[in-house]
């Protein structure tokens, strides 16, 4: 019996169509994705395969102007209009509290959503129940099918969904409802979920009774045979792990910002075994066609987004300062609102000992493009936002060691003087230069705020201690030439959309003056 | 739980047809086929035929001419209709599941007079 | 037709021992190989499936590798419940048996 899974992943509010980066379509003739052209697609196979299940691991929440204004509601209604199966909760799904899951998509749904690791107690546990499930039987054909679901364990760290959810670990979670499954003689199981491919890789190993595993998080892209488009795949798809009870499981991912669609063919034995899977991501290029009544939806919709686009987000009683004259010689007054920003957004997870998770910011100077001038009534429009930051990015969290920071405030003025993008605006750092030095040895101080403690306060940068910083991906992928970020760092979570983060932070502080306060010397 | 349970004669006079039932219960036969497999008595395993999922059958091209696979998936039952017995015949005869996963428990058919 | 070579056809061995049995289709299978126990009894359970992963149940001293045309059995540790026939069984076509690998207590 075979099944065709087609899957989505980290799909960030790409609603439209993309450029081939994932950024905003320009050139329509060469872009990609969107929910019109997923649509034609998934229909294409509904119509050619006999059992068909449209899935999605997690974070549909976040990334566009879509999310900013919408807030869910727009993946609730085109994930029914695609008629998806079922999808897990990702950690972006909690970025509006748990009030902005459960509103705008849990109650609005028309299919299910699961996670077998989140369990919710206190006044939540009775507004939240049936909600989310750990897992649904879902029938295909002549044969059924079990769902459980995950989200990662860090969801506390990486977004907002308050007191009373705990998030325990996925396996854990996972080995009983798998086993609940197995006693209503549900023996294909695929788990769908969001924790990241390493994870998936855990649980296709140690969860006993998983068949298939189908994730996200981790954007990775997997490919057989020689890819179609730019991302490089980071083994073959499916990518099959030996379980520890000596079977061959599929892992499965489809890289992010629904510019693939997932395919993967599994064949059960009639004890539901996988007897053989293949496939590979088919790209949503242009070659596909919009179908045309979902376009119009999606253009239906777009007018609101049009108009919130010029509304004032707050105000600014100062100069913005974001020139690259500025910004990529010495800190700029747009660098640390940035980080502000950045830092405000992972406001989360304080206890008696870290009065935050995380301190820290840096920001490549080249990122920001524009300057905002206080003199047109100090207004400060998502239109604005969008020239300083144009390229569609994330503010990301990631774990480095000390050294390695070290070594990228080095990258920063290796080349000092020439205007290049990789001169660093902070946040929560002191650096001091002496540009008289040679390249590579020019860091002379290098304080950091901590965050183990009830007063914060600047302390000397530790070459062994790990710390968490939040940076933009384009960073945490080694652009600029920070490459040392990319091979050393330790841990990567995706963020929020870039200019969502400094629009909610305007938009909360109402009025802002930032200063340039000697983060750099 | 998955299963084949087989029934029939465990004796067949010489040119007369023998019929074996196998009853599957844990799975869906419009999902999965049936294979049908012989052991003559000290010697390998050999193919016989298959129903599939949708219905229609493939057979050894040894015995194409008087072997017959049917199935009620109502009733979960495949039928094997085999004619002309002849004493060579004489074998364990096994419904296995599609992938092999599965084995009935084997009906040894003597063919006599 | 796909023919399967299955070798050796019988062996003897003692309770420890790490035994192998190969076979050789004649034409590519592409992993759609399984091994077979019988019992002398005559019941007949898969071991292994698509070439190499385990039934659930099984032992794991038994593995199973190859790829194209070439396919190994392996038990790493021979156990007294282990004397029993082996077949390989090839599904990439109308399912072929390989002849068989007896294997005795030495």
């Known amino acids: 019996w075979e099944l065709t899974i087609l899957h989505t992943n980290d799909v960030h509010s790409r609603l439209e169509q993309t450029s081939e980066d994932s950024s905003k379509c320009v050139n329509a003739s060469r872009c990609m994705g969107g929910v019109a052209r997923l649509f034609t697609k998934v229909q294409q196979i509904r119509r050619a395969e006999p059992n068909v299940l449209l899935l999605d691991a997690g974070d549909q929440y976040q990334g566009t102007i879509w999310f900013t204004v919408y807030k869910g509601a727009e993946v609730a209604h085109f994930m029914n209009a695609l008629r998806y199966d079922a999808m897990a909760l990702g950690n972006h799904e909690f970025d509006n509290g748990v009030e902005g899951l459960i509103e705008p998509l849990l109650k609005e749904a028309k299919f299910p959503i699961l996670s077998a690791n989140i369990k919710a107690k206190g006044p939540l546990a009775s507004q939240i129940s049936g909600l989310y499930l750990p897992y649904k039987v879902l029938p295909v054909g002549d044969e059924v099918v079990g769902i459980v679901g995950y989200t990662s364990k860090e969801t506390p760290f990486l977004s907002n969904p308050g007191t009373n959810l705990v998030f325990e670990d996925e396996i854990t979670a996972l080995q009983p409802e798998v086993d609940k499954l197995k006693t209503l003689n549900v023996n294909k199981i695929i788990a769908l979920g969001h924790s990241g491919f390493e994870t998936d890789k855990l649980i296709a190993q140690k969860v006993r009774g998983v068949d298939v595993v189908v994730g996200g998080h981790s954007n990775t892209f997997l490919y057989t045979g020689n890819p179609p488009s730019k991302e490089v795949p980071a083994g073959k798809y499916p990518f099959i792990v030996t379980s520890d009870d000596g079977r061959k499981v599929p892992v499965v991912q489809a890289y992010a910002f629904g510019k693939y669609l997932g395919y993967l063919k599994i064949e059960f034995d009639e004890r539901g075994n996988v007897i053989s899977s293949h496939g590979n991501p088919i790209l949503l290029n242009s070659s596909i066609p919009e179908d045309p009544s979902i376009k119009a939806d999606i253009n239906k919709w777009r007018i609101k987004l049009d108009n919130y686009s010029t509304q004032e987000l707050g105000k600014t009683i100062v100069y913005l300062d974001g020139s690259s004259q500025s910004c990529r010689f010495r800190e700029c007054n747009m660098g640390n609102l940035i980080c502000d920003a950045m830092i405000n957004n992972n406001l989360r997870h304080a206890d008696e000992m870290f009065w935050n998770h995380v301190s820290m910011c840096i920001l490549n100077g080249g990122g920001i493009r524009s300057p905002i001038d206080e003199r047109n009534n100090g207004t400060i429009t998502w239109e604005n936002l969008a020239a300083v930051l144009p390229f569609g990015g994330t503010f990301d969290l990631v774990q480095l060691k000390g050294s390695t920071l070290k070594k990228a405030f080095e990258h920063s003025v290796h080349r000092y003087g020439q205007s290049t993008g990789e001169f660093l605006q902070v946040g929560g750092i002191h650096v001091v230069y002496d540009l008289s030095r040679k390249p590579g040895d020019r860091v002379v101080k290098l304080d950091v705020l901590c965050t183990k403690c009830r007063v914060p306060s600047y302390d000397p940068l530790k070459m062994d201690e790990i710390y968490k910083v939040i940076l933009p991906n384009f960073l945490a992928n080694g652009g600029d030439g920070f490459q040392m970020i990319k091979d050393e760092l330790l841990r990567h979570d995706s963020g929020d959309q870039d200019i969502n983060v400094v629009s909610t932070y305007i938009s909360k502080m109402k009025v802002i003056y930032p200063a340039v306060e000697g983060r750099i010397k | 739980e998955v299963t084949l349970k087989q029934s029939g004669p465990g004796l067949v006079k010489p040119t007369e047809t023998l019929t074996l039932t196998c009853t599957v219960s844990g799975f869906s036969l419009s999902s999965y086929g049936i294979q049908w497999v012989r052991q003559p008595p000290g010697k390998g395993l050999e193919w016989l035929g298959v129903?599939?999922?949708?219905?229609?059958?493939d057979y050894n091209a040894a015995f194409i001419s008087r072997l017959t696979i049917s199935k009620d998936t109502s009733k979960s039952q495949v039928v094997l209709t085999m004619t002309n017995m002849d004493p060579v015949d004489t074998a364990t005869y096994y419904c296995?599941?599609?992938?092999?996963?599965?084995w009935g428990q084997g009906t040894l058919v003597t063919v006599s007079s | 037709d796909i023919q399967m070579t299955q070798s050796p056809s019988s062996l003897s061995a003692s309770v420890g021992d790490r035994v192998t049995i190969t076979c050789r289709a004649s034409q590519d299978i592409g992993d759609r190989l399984n091994w077979l126990q019988q019992k002398p009894g005559g019941a007949i359970k898969r071991l292994i499936y698509?070439?190499?992963s385990l039934d659930s149940g099984v032992p794991k001293r038994f593995s199973g590798s190859g790829s194209g045309t070439e396919y190994t059995l392996t038990i790493s540790s021979l156990q007294p419940e282990d004397f029993a026939t082996y077949y390989c069984?090839?599904?990439?076509?109308?399912?072929?048996f390989g002849g068989g690998t007896k294997v005795e207590i030495k």
């Open positions: 069984l090839q599904y990439a076509g109308s399912w072929t």
């Open positions: 698509a070439t190499s």
């Open positions: 296995a599941g599609q992938y092999g996963s599965v």
């Open positions: 129903i599939w999922s949708g219905g229609s059958a």
